[in-house]
């Protein structure tokens, strides 16, 4: 998985989308984790309501909210009064029994600058031809999780 | 302060391959992409790719995507390009220049670049 | 990929006065996030590329205010106010909108 990198401004709001196959992962729930460290886990910050039927429920852990849109196919997570502390490498998952699928790799950035608030929630999907627009952002990740190799995103 | 110290001149023979090193110093090396840019006598400047260190992530110009490589050491903060297969048209003098780090109001350019390392492809 | 063009090949002009050179893209370079990702670099002989302009008209540090960048979309234009001996050399743009990044063929100022 490449990273898609999502950047916000300090105190508004972030919606981060996680676009996955609506057939494939039918009747899964989804979860949003932060990545702990170079080679950590990825700890668990939210997931869908328990019962699959009602994933389009917000699902609230503290300042972070959860909702997916099954028939659609699109996970959205909402980081509320974004703070500086919230940078970081995440994952959207799909779970299955024990397993967590990998939906996709997020970098959040977390702007002081509010003269470059233009910059805020923009995502940008490389795309598949030869060209294409650039993400913008200090790094991206192609590695597995299961190869243990996610490293930890700078803090500078 | 930000340097990039590229490996010396190299003469190497057609259908040969070969390896030129980029040192970083004053940085976070592995959090910032490494770009290679290629220039040919008296030529304007190509972009082969870049890598970011930190994970070895690459992305590569369509035209050099077979025959480049792109990699990184961390612990020696050093970036490597490795061509192959070379001929007369790889004669060229090959950049390694840092992408400006994201900050907001100046990002993505390349704001620091190596002397270059110049490079002669002949029999 | 996106093709830069810049005009003219060779600028001759004289110290002190003001020099222009111009930069097209086949495309717009105005990324999805709404900033435009056009820059400067000025090659003195023998040496490598420096980055006078990032982002159209933003200074790279230490470049003096004789140096402006402007344009918009796929037109782009680099001024040097008051020419001096040490900005003689071959000046570069480029993009970093889209993968792969872009430059143009240069333009060799010189002294008329």
């Known amino acids: 998985h490449n990273t898609t990198v999502f950047q916000g401004v300090a105190g508004q709001s972030l919606q981060v989308s996680c676009p996955y196959d609506s057939m494939k992962h039918w009747a899964r729930r989804k979860a949003w984790c932060r990545q702990l460290g170079e080679k950590g886990p990825c700890q668990r910050v939210v997931s869908t309501h328990n019962l699959w039927l009602l994933s389009f429920l917000r699902r609230w852990n503290g300042s972070t909210a959860i909702t997916d849109d099954t028939l659609g196919g699109t996970l959205t997570i909402t980081l509320r009064n974004l703070q500086p502390h919230d940078a970081g490498l995440y994952q959207c998952q799909s779970l299955h029994g024990s397993e967590a699928d990998t939906l996709r790799k997020v970098l959040v950035e977390v702007l002081a600058d509010p003269l470059d608030h233009r910059d805020a929630g923009d995502l940008w999907f490389p795309g598949e031809s030869e060209s294409f627009e650039d993400a913008h952002v200090e790094h991206s990740i192609s590695r597995s999780l299961l190869e243990g190799e996610i490293p930890f995103p700078p803090t500078s | 302060q930000v340097q990039l110290q590229q490996s010396g001149p190299e003469l190497v023979k057609p259908g040969a391959s070969l390896k030129i090193s980029c040192k970083a110093s004053?940085?976070?090396?592995?959090?910032?992409?490494m770009n290679w840019v290629k220039q040919r006598p008296g030529k304007g400047l190509e972009w082969i790719g870049r890598?970011?260190?930190?994970?070895?992530?690459?992305n590569y110009n369509g035209e050099f995507r077979v025959r480049a490589t792109l990699t990184a050491d961390t612990s020696s903060t050093t970036a490597y390009m490795q061509l192959s297969s070379l001929t007369s048209e790889d004669s060229a003098v090959y950049f390694c220049?840092?992408?400006?780090?994201?900050?907001?109001?100046?990002?993505?350019?390349?704001?620091?670049w190596g002397q270059g390392a110049s490079v002669t492809v002949s029999s | 990929d996106v093709v830069m063009t810049q005009t003219p090949l060779s600028l001759p002009v004289s110290l002190g006065d003001q020099a222009s050179i111009s930069c097209r893209s086949s495309?717009?370079?105005?990324?999805?996030?709404?900033?435009?990702?056009l820059h400067w670099y000025l090659q003195k002989p023998g040496q490598s590329p420096k980055l006078l302009i990032y982002k159209v008209s933003n200074r790279f540090s230490g470049v003096p205010d004789r140096f402006s960048g402007s344009g918009s979309g796929t037109d782009f234009t680099l001024k040097i106010s008051r020419v001096e001996a040490d900005d003689l050399g071959v000046y570069f743009c480029?993009?970093?909108?889209?993968?792969?990044?872009?430059f143009g063929g240069g333009t060799k100022l010189e002294i008329k």
């Open positions: 890598i970011y260190p930190g994970d070895g992530d690459t």
């Open positions: 220049a840092r992408l400006l780090r994201n900050q907001p109001g100046e990002s993505y350019a390349m704001d620091y």
């Open positions: 495309q717009s370079l105005v990324h999805s996030n709404g900033y435009t990702y």
């Open positions: 004053g940085y976070a090396f592995s959090s910032s992409w």
């Open positions: 480029s993009q970093s909108t889209r993968v792969p990044y872009t």
